[in-house]
Interface confidence: medium
């Protein structure tokens, strides 16, 4: 199923400044049926000292983030649940300078999830924080409907169908 | 290039299957397969896309879905086959490449295959 | 559904002169407008995309600008080859103008 309901909250500066960084994100349904609640709490726990931000093992460090690029394939929910798992969340590009960076580090010429996807409640491409894309800056090559999620390729965002397993990369 | 083939004059209802043969590349991930018509005499309406990539999703206008279908047959090859035809089907029928990021536009097109029903 | 308004339907000016065809979206596409240009028994020819970027081998006669929700095409030095039928595409698949005929007298 794909989330589209809920909302990421954004950590910014490495705080999570107000009451409501707690809400529940709501129920995610995986794949194999069940469920189970994402709390924001988790989503700030390691953003907590962003200028000084250390990096764990086996993660990229760029621009005073983390990255971690996957070398399995998932569908584009399984590939979100897996980066909240780890206090993480699916890639979001705030600009071309950190896809560049993203472009350098993909060894594989195949496409890779980011956390970028078509709402039906919003009805437009919302990353996985909550915030919209900025169409003036990225284009979302193919079309955008419902069960729609964004993967790139060669410094492009593809629109694909959720359920295609791809490589992801995580952030936090 | 791209060259399209399997036009023919057919009789209302009858189904048809058109083919777009790739030449000097073959299919891969990064851009769209599509076919798109024109009337005599009118414009270009857009019918469907494939992903060239390994999961192949297709895309299809609202009025096209149910009667067209977008397949890719071969690395080289894509077809589309046609149902139910009626007049308003008489076309010639374009098979076109989008690989652009900046925008929805196609950047090779075959020369066109006609449709008369 | 985004829709595109392609003005005027027809246009006829003399080799030399100038042709601006305007292109209005139903709601912004910010600058994601292809320009196409066909001639008759062809396939249309892509002359210009994101509003303002000439494809490889288009004259710099050829000008692409505008938006958001309006775009123009102008055409400069006209020749006698530039006499075609004139197609915008908007950031969608199936956004296509209604198409300008243009003559050159």
């Known amino acids: 199923l794909l989330v589209s309901q809920g909302v990421l909250l954004k950590c910014q500066k490495g705080s999570c400044s107000n009451a409501t960084q707690y809400e529940d994100t709501g129920d995610l349904k995986v794949n194999n049926g069940t469920r189970r609640n994402i709390s924001n709490k988790d989503l700030c726990a390691s953003r907590s000292a962003d200028q000084t931000v250390l990096c764990q093992s086996e993660w990229l460090k760029y621009q005073g983030k983390c990255y971690w690029f996957s070398n399995e394939m998932k569908s584009w929910s399984d590939s979100y649940v897996y980066c909240l798992e780890r206090k993480s969340h699916l890639l979001i590009i705030h600009d071309q300078l950190e896809m560049a960076f993203i472009q350098k580090n993909l060894r594989q010429l195949n496409y890779v999830w980011i956390g970028l996807n078509f709402t039906s409640l919003k009805m437009t491409w919302t990353w996985v924080d909550g915030s919209p894309i900025d169409s003036k800056i990225f284009f979302i090559k193919g079309p955008a409907k419902e069960n729609s999620c964004a993967a790139i390729k060669e410094s492009k965002i593809f629109s694909e169908t959720c359920s295609s397993v791809f490589k992801w990369i995580c952030q936090y | 290039s791209l060259e399209e083939s399997g036009g023919d004059l057919v009789k209302p209802g009858a189904s048809l299957t058109l083919t777009c043969t790739a030449s000097?590349?073959?299919?891969?991930?990064?851009?769209?397969m599509c076919w798109v018509r024109q009337a005599p005499g009118k414009g270009l309406e857009w019918i469907a896309c494939i992903y060239a990539g390994s999961s192949g999703s297709t895309h299809y206008a609202s009025w096209a879905k149910g009667r067209f279908t977008i397949s890719k047959t071969s690395s080289t090859t894509v077809t589309l086959q046609m149902t139910s035809l009626t007049a308003a089907d008489t076309a010639t029928h374009f098979c076109?490449?989008?690989?652009?990021?900046?925008?929805?536009?196609?950047?090779?097109w075959g020369p066109g295959t006609l449709v008369t029903v | 559904d985004i829709v595109m308004t392609q003005t005027p339907a027809s246009v006829e000016a003399a080799v030399g002169g100038t042709v601006t065809i305007k292109c209005q979206a139903s709601q912004s596409i910010y600058s994601w407008l292809a320009w196409y240009q066909q001639k008759p028994g062809q396939p249309p020819k892509l002359l210009i995309y994101k509003a303002s970027t000439l494809a490889s081998g288009v004259p710099s006669r050829f000008k692409g600008s505008g938006s958001g929700t309006d775009f123009t095409l102008t055409i400069s030095d006209l020749e006698c080859d530039d006499a075609a039928t004139y197609y915008c595409q908007g950031n969608s698949w199936g956004a296509f103008g209604g198409g300008t005929e243009v003559v050159v007298k």
């Open positions: 076109a490449r989008d690989d652009g990021n900046s925008g929805d536009y196609f950047k090779i």
């Open positions: 000097g590349f073959s299919f891969s991930s990064g851009y769209y």
